[in-house]
C-alpha cells in the first residue's frame, strides 16, 4: 500500500529500522547514538548551506517476542513486518535506514513497491546486487569476489610470479552474517569467482581443513578462510602446516592488525589477512568509544547513512526539487559524499567502494605488514611492500598447485 | 600532468653526504610508490630502492643498503634521498622514477647530477 | 640477481628499416619491460608487461617474448626513434636493467 511520506514543507524525516535480527549483534543503543550523532553533523551542515529546514530520525521497532533469534537466518519477515508497521502508522520518512540482514532486505525489496531509497549497513549477499533503490555502506561479496580473483590472476609482482587457478574455501556454516554471504558468494557456482576458477572444493568439517594442511595429494595450496586470527588458532591450532600453504585470511571488519602493540602470533604465518583501511578518527570519537573494533565499521555504516541522506537531501533542496519522487530514490549511488571519517564512494549500484589491504605476517619484526591495497572503486591493486619478509621460499608466494613447476606464465592479456 | 622535479647538481667532496629531493605533482603522492635509479657515466641503469609514501614501507637494492637513506614528506608531495659517506663512484646522475603499477618506473624526474671529487 | 643482456649493444640503421633488439635474462622471467632514453633526458616508459605500449608510443613499436627471449621491434624506423633502449625486469627482486641498445643513424 502506498504510504505517505513525511517528507515535505522543510521537515525531513528518516525511518529506521531497529531489528532484533541483526548483521552484527550491536546493542540497538549504540545504532541510535551513531544515528543521532550523524542528524547532528547534517543538521549543521544543512545550516552552513542556508537551508533551514528539520531533520529527525524515527526509530522503528520490532516485535522482540516474535523475533528475538537476533540471528540473520531467521530475519526473512522481520523486515516485512516492520513495514506493515510503518504502513499501519501511516509514518514513512524519506528514506529507510536498515535491515542489514540479506534476507530481510532481499524479501523487503521483492514486496513492497519501493519507491523510497533504502539504506543498508549489512546486506551482504549476492542476492541483493544491483537493486536500483538499495544502497550498501559495508563492502558487500561482489567487491570481495572481485579482489580475489584479480588477486589469483596476477602474476607480475615480484612476490607473486604465478597466477592462482585454483582454492579450497573453508565454510562450516557457524559464520558471521559478513563471512556467510561472503563464503556463500565463493561457493555458489554461478558466481564470477567459480566462473573464473579451475577448481574450487568447498570444506565444511574441520577435519576436512585440518588434513588438508599436509595432504601430499591437495589440489591446491590456497584455502579461503573468513574470520579473526582467534577463529583460525581454534581450528588450526599449533598443527604443522606443509610449507607452499597459503591461508587467505577475510577480516575485513577488524581494525586490530593497524594498532601499535599487535604482535602477529606464531600459527599466522601462512596467512595473508584481507581487511580494510582502517579509519583515522573513529578511535576516540564519541559514538566509538565503548564499540569493538569489528563494531565500529556497523555504527559507522548506519552514521554515514545518515550522512548520506543529508548530503542528497541538500542537493536536492538547492536543485529546488522534490524529495518524494522515483528520481530521488534512484539518486543514492554513482556519488562521492563527505562520511564521518572522510569521503565515501558509492559505485553505480549504490554500493560502497572501500581500500582493502592484504597483509602479511613479517618473520623479522613478527607484525602484521601491508603487503598490498586494492581500491574497490577502480578495482586497481597497489602494491606496498616489494620485498616482504615472507615465510614462504624465496619470499615468493608459492604457486597454487603443487609441483606445477616453473610454470609462470598462465598469462591473461 | 604527472611531474617529478628533483632537485639542482651537487659537487661534493669525497666522505660527505648529499640529500636529493623529489617534488611530486598531478597526481596523489601517497598512491604510488618512488623508486629511486642510479646512472653512472657509462654504466647500465641501477635500482637503489623503492618506498610506499602513505605507509613509509621502504625496500632497497642489497647493493645500496649502507649508502642510500629514502625519505619522505608527505604533507609536501616529496620524497628523498640522502647518499652517504661518498665516494668518486657514487658520481652519478640519480633518477626518482614513479609506479603506476602494472607500468613500474612510469614517470621519471629529470634527474640530479651528483659529482664526487676533491 | 637477473642479468639481463641486451644485443645488439649498437645498432646503425636508416629510416624506415625494421629494427630488432634482444633482451636475454639470466633465468625465466614473466614480463620484460622496456625504456627509451635520449642523450640529455631522462629515460621514458615505453613497453610495460613484454606487449602494452606506454601512453604516447606510436604503434610502430612492439614487444613480444617470453622465458628468458625478449624483443622490442620497431617495424619501421623513423628519425625520432634513433636514442637508447633499455630492458628490465621486476620478476626477481631486485628490478635488474639491460645494458641498452644504441639505435644510431646509418
Known amino acids: 500500500s502506498q504510504v505517505s511520506q513525511n517528507c515535505h514543507n522543510g521537515s525531513y524525516e528518516i525511518s529506521v529500522l531497529m531489528m532484533g535480527n541483526s548483521a552484527f549483534a550491536e546493542p540497538l543503543k549504540n545504532l541510535e547514538d551513531a544515528v543521532n550523532e550523524g542528524l547532528e553533523i547534517v543538521r549543521g551542515r544543512l545550516q552552513n548551506a542556508g537551508l533551514n529546514v528539520t531533520v529527525n530520525a524515527t526509530f522503528m521497532y520490532s516485535d522482540g517476542l516474535i523475533h528475538n533469534s537476533g540471528d540473520c537466518r531467521s530475519s526473512t519477515c522481520e523486515g516485512l513486518d516492520l513495514l506493515r508497521k510503518i504502513s499501519n502508522a501511516q509514518r514513512m520518512g524519506c528514506v529507510l535506514i536498515g535491515p542489514s540482514c540479506t534476507y530481510s532486505t532481499f524479501q523487503m525489496y521483492l514486496d513492497t513497491e519501493l519507491s523510497y531509497p533504502m539504506i543498508s549497513a549489512g546486506s551482504f549477499g549476492l542476492s541483493c546486487d544491483y537493486k536500483e533503490t538499495l544502497t550498501r555502506l559495508m563492502s558487500p561479496a561482489r567487491k570481495l569476489m572481485y579482489f580475489l580473483v584479480n588477486f589469483w590472476k596476477t602474476n607480475d609482482l615480484p612476490f607473486k610470479t604465478y597466477s592462482w587457478s585454483t582454492s579450497y574455501v573453508y565454510k562450516n556454516g557457524t559464520e558471521t552474517e559478513d563471512c556467510f554471504w561472503y563464503l556463500n558468494a565463493l561457493e555458489a557456482s554461478v558466481s564470477y569467482f567459480s566462473h573464473e576458477l579451475g577448481f574450487k572444493v568447498v570444506l565444511r568439517q574441520d577435519k576436512e581443513f585440518q588434513d588438508i594442511l599436509m595432504d601430499h595429494n591437495r589440489k591446491s595450496n590456497v584455502i579461503i578462510m573468513c574470520g579473526g586470527p582467534e577463529f583460525l588458532y581454534k581450528l588450526k591450532g599449533d598443527r604443522a602446516v606443509a610449507e607452499d600453504i597459503v591461508i587467505i585470511l577475510v577480516d575485513l571488519f577488524n581494525d586490530q592488525y593497524f594498532e601499535d602493540n599487535v604482535t602477529a602470533p606464531d600459527y599466522m604465518k601462512n596467512v595473508l589477512v584481507l581487511t580494510l583501511s582502517p579509519g583515522n578518527s573513529l578511535l576516540n570519537s564519541s559514538f566509538s568509544r565503548n564499540l569493538s573494533p569489528t563494531k565500529r565499521d556497523f555504527a559507522l555504516a548506519y552514521l554515514n547513512g545518515i550522512l548520506l541522506f543529508g548530503h542528497m537531501l541538500k542537493i536536492f533542496l538547492e536543485n529546488g526539487e522534490n524529495i518524494t519522487t522515483p528520481k530521488f530514490a534512484h539518486a543514492f549511488r554513482n556519488l562521492t559524499f563527505e562520511g564521518y571519517d572522510g569521503p565515501v564512494t558509492l559505485d553505480d549500484w549504490g554500493d560502497v567502494d572501500s581500500t582493502m589491504v592484504l597483509l602479511y605476517t613479517s618473520v623479522d619484526t613478527k607484525k602484521y605488514k601491508v603487503l598490498l591495497t586494492y581500491d574497490t572503486h577502480v578495482n586497481k591493486t597497489y602494491p606496498v611492500d616489494m620485498s616482504p619478509t615472507f615465510t614462504w621460499k624465496n619470499s615468493k608466494l608459492p604457486n597454487d598447485i603443487t609441483g606445477r613447476g616453473p610454470q609462470h606464465h598462465h598469462h591473461h592479456h | 600532468e604527472v611531474q617529478l622535479v628533483q632537485s639542482g647538481a651537487e659537487v661534493k667532496k669525497p666522505g660527505a653526504s648529499v640529500k636529493v629531493s623529489c617534488k611530486a605533482s598531478?597526481?596523489?603522492?601517497?598512491?604510488?610508490?618512488m623508486n629511486w635509479v642510479k646512472q653512472a657515466p657509462g654504466q647500465r641503469l641501477e635500482w637503489m630502492g623503492v618506498m610506499n609514501p602513505k605507509f613509509g614501507t621502504i625496500n632497497y637494492n642489497q647493493k645500496f643498503k649502507d649508502k642510500a637513506t629514502i625519505t619522505r614528506d608527505t604533507s609536501a608531495s616529496t620524497a628523498y634521498m640522502e647518499l652517504s659517506s661518498l665516494r668518486s663512484e657514487d658520481t652519478a646522475v640519480y633518477y626518482c622514477?614513479?609506479?603506476?603499477?602494472?607500468?613500474?618506473?612510469?614517470?621519471w624526474g629529470q634527474g640530479t647530477t651528483v659529482t664526487v671529487s676533491s | 640477481d637477473i642479468q639481463l643482456t641486451q644485443s645488439p649493444s649498437f645498432l646503425s640503421a636508416s629510416p624506415g628499416d625494421r629494427v630488432t633488439i634482444t633482451c636475454s635474462a639470466s633465468?625465466?622471467?614473466?614480463?620484460m619491460y622496456w625504456y627509451q632514453q635520449k642523450p640529455g633526458s631522462s629515460p621514458k616508459s615505453w613497453i610495460y608487461r613484454t606487449q602494452n605500449l606506454a601512453s604516447g608510443v606510436p604503434s610502430r613499436f612492439s614487444g613480444s617474448g617470453s622465458g628468458t627471449e625478449y624483443t622490442l621491434t620497431i617495424s619501421s624506423l623513423q628519425p625520432e626513434d634513433f636514442a637508447t633502449y633499455y630492458c628490465?625486469?621486476?620478476?626477481?627482486?631486485?628490478?635488474?636493467f639491460g645494458g641498452g641498445t644504441k639505435v644510431e643513424i646509418k
Open positions: 598531478g597526481y596523489t603522492f601517497t598512491d604510488h610508490n
Open positions: 622514477a614513479r609506479d603506476d603499477y602494472p607500468n613500474y618506473f612510469d614517470y
Open positions: 628490465q625486469q621486476y620478476h626477481d627482486y631486485p628490478p635488474t
Open positions: 633465468s625465466s622471467v614473466n614480463y
